[in-house]
């Protein structure tokens, strides 16, 4: 038997995809086990295998169909268990009613590029991935720059509380290397959070001319 | 600008069944959700269901679910409600509606039933 | 079925003044709360989403908030144009409820 702690967490990208960390204190590190979703009001379901991150804990992505198909909508629940073999039978570690629109967290943003560059100025695009039509324009976005010689960690928060696929940086130094990241985060849903960061998007300055300034 | 321009007013017997019309400009039809929304005298606004166009699919209040449904067709961008087995206590005014699936966005300027024998 | 209660049902309030309307869910919706403004002759209109988000121009002066299971809409300055019906709906359960409505008349 497997004892201690467990906790069983997953998020729903609003399209096709659920993802699941499973956390269990004292789990056995070699026990096959797995994510199986069965939808209140669908005719499919679906298992995936959890695969360790860490010393005691697991994730593995629920993939229900093309990564652009509106698979559920926010009538729906999800039971999800973790199922782990014992032997020859499959014992329930986990289960929760899982209401999708209520656990949101999309995928990060893709496709940042430069706009327009400055010696003092930025503007920046991106794209949102996977995003259910759903939202509407209803979508906040959390921007930071990463300046010489800090870390992400001390970059301040730029948020946009609206959907704004863009952004122009101000107060920029001259010739200098800069790095930008992004994320998005729906209104709906009492357990959504952040998305992931975007992957970074590296830019520089152009140098002020000399005697004057652009 | 995002518009519904919905039917005219209908006058409807008993037992009947009446179709709304709601066309609709402005955005991508085929990425919408249409609600359709009854507010009959004195009862306040209740909503009646949906039609998601982008998964093609339906959801109604179980109090509607026997009696209503809602169609699109994408090459018009034109949502339709339709009512059956008409009774005098659906004489309302019905509003088709575009949002999300939590609340509704724009509306559509009503269309008026009127159930008399 | 989750059961929205609004009051009061009418609210008297002279112009310039801050007019207070309240909506009580039966049981726990979150921030699951919307509110609509319905002038006569006109289709509802939404102001505010998920409790406190105003709709992009929404004028300022109106505003939600949240405690447990009761949700206010406050406006700050009354207009002339703000006497109206205004309905709040949730969209934790289906299916989706509206209050009866609170009634918002010139003193």
């Known amino acids: 038997a497997v004892n201690g702690t467990s906790q069983f967490t997953c998020f729903y990208n609003s399209r096709a995809n659920i993802s699941c960390v499973w956390s269990q204190d004292g789990a056995l590190q070699d026990t096959s086990c797995q994510v199986h979703a069965w939808p209140d009001r669908r005719r499919w379901n679906q298992t995936c295998e959890l695969l360790p991150v860490s010393q005691a804990s697991w994730a593995c992505n629920l993939i229900l169909g093309a990564p652009d198909s509106q698979k559920l909508t926010t009538v729906d629940i999800v039971t999800l268990r973790v199922l782990c073999r014992e032997g020859v039978r499959w014992r329930v570690m986990a289960i929760q009613d899982f209401k999708p629109f209520e656990n949101l967290r999309l995928m990060a943003p893709i496709s940042l590029q430069v706009v327009h560059v400055e010696t003092h100025r930025c503007n920046i695009s991106w794209e949102i991935s996977q995003a259910s039509h759903y939202f509407e324009r209803h979508l906040e976005f959390e921007a930071r720059t990463l300046s010489p010689g800090h870390t992400w960690e001390e970059a301040p928060l730029l948020t946009l509380k609206q959907k704004q696929e863009w952004i122009c940086l101000e107060t920029l130094t001259p010739d200098t290397q800069y790095e930008f990241q992004v994320r998005v985060k729906p209104l709906q849903g009492e357990f959504t959070t952040w998305s992931p960061w975007s992957q970074p998007l590296a830019f520089r300055t152009k140098p002020a001319a000399l005697g004057k300034d652009t | 600008e995002v518009q519904l321009v919905q039917s005219g007013a209908e006058v409807k017997k008993p037992g009947a069944t009446v179709k709304i019309s709601c066309k609709v400009s402005?955005?991508?039809?085929?990425?919408?959700?249409i609600h359709w929304v009854q507010q009959a005298p004195g009862k306040g606004l209740e909503w009646m269901g949906w039609?998601?166009?982008?998964?093609?699919?339906?959801e109604y209040a179980p109090g509607f679910q026997d009696r209503v449904t809602i169609t699109a067709d994408t090459s018009t961008d034109t949502a339709y409600m339709e009512l059956s087995s008409l009774r005098s206590e659906d004489t309302a005014v019905y509003y088709c509606?575009?949002?999300?699936?939590?609340?509704?966005?724009?509306w559509g300027q009503g269309t008026t039933v009127t159930v008399s024998s | 079925e989750i059961v929205m209660t609004q009051s009061p049902a009418t609210l008297s309030v002279s112009p310039g003044e801050r007019a207070t309307l309240s909506c009580r869910a039966s049981?726990?919706?979150?921030?699951?709360l919307h509110w609509y403004q319905q002038k006569p002759g006109q289709a509802p209109r939404l102001l505010i989403i998920?409790?406190?988000q105003s709709i992009s121009g929404i004028p300022a002066r109106f505003s939600g908030s949240r405690s447990g299971t009761e949700f206010t809409l406050t406006i700050s300055s009354l207009q002339s144009e703000d006497f109206a019906v205004y309905f709040c709906?949730?969209?934790?359960?289906?299916?989706?409820?509206f209050g009866q409505g609170t009634k918002l008349e010139i003193k």
């Open positions: 709906q949730q969209s934790n359960n289906f299916p989706y409820t």
């Open positions: 049981q726990i919706i979150s921030n699951n």
């Open positions: 509606a575009r949002g999300g699936p939590w609340f509704l966005s724009y």
């Open positions: 402005g955005f991508n039809f085929k990425y919408s959700l």
């Open positions: 039609i998601d166009n982008e998964a093609g699919e339906t």
């Open positions: 998920y409790g406190l």
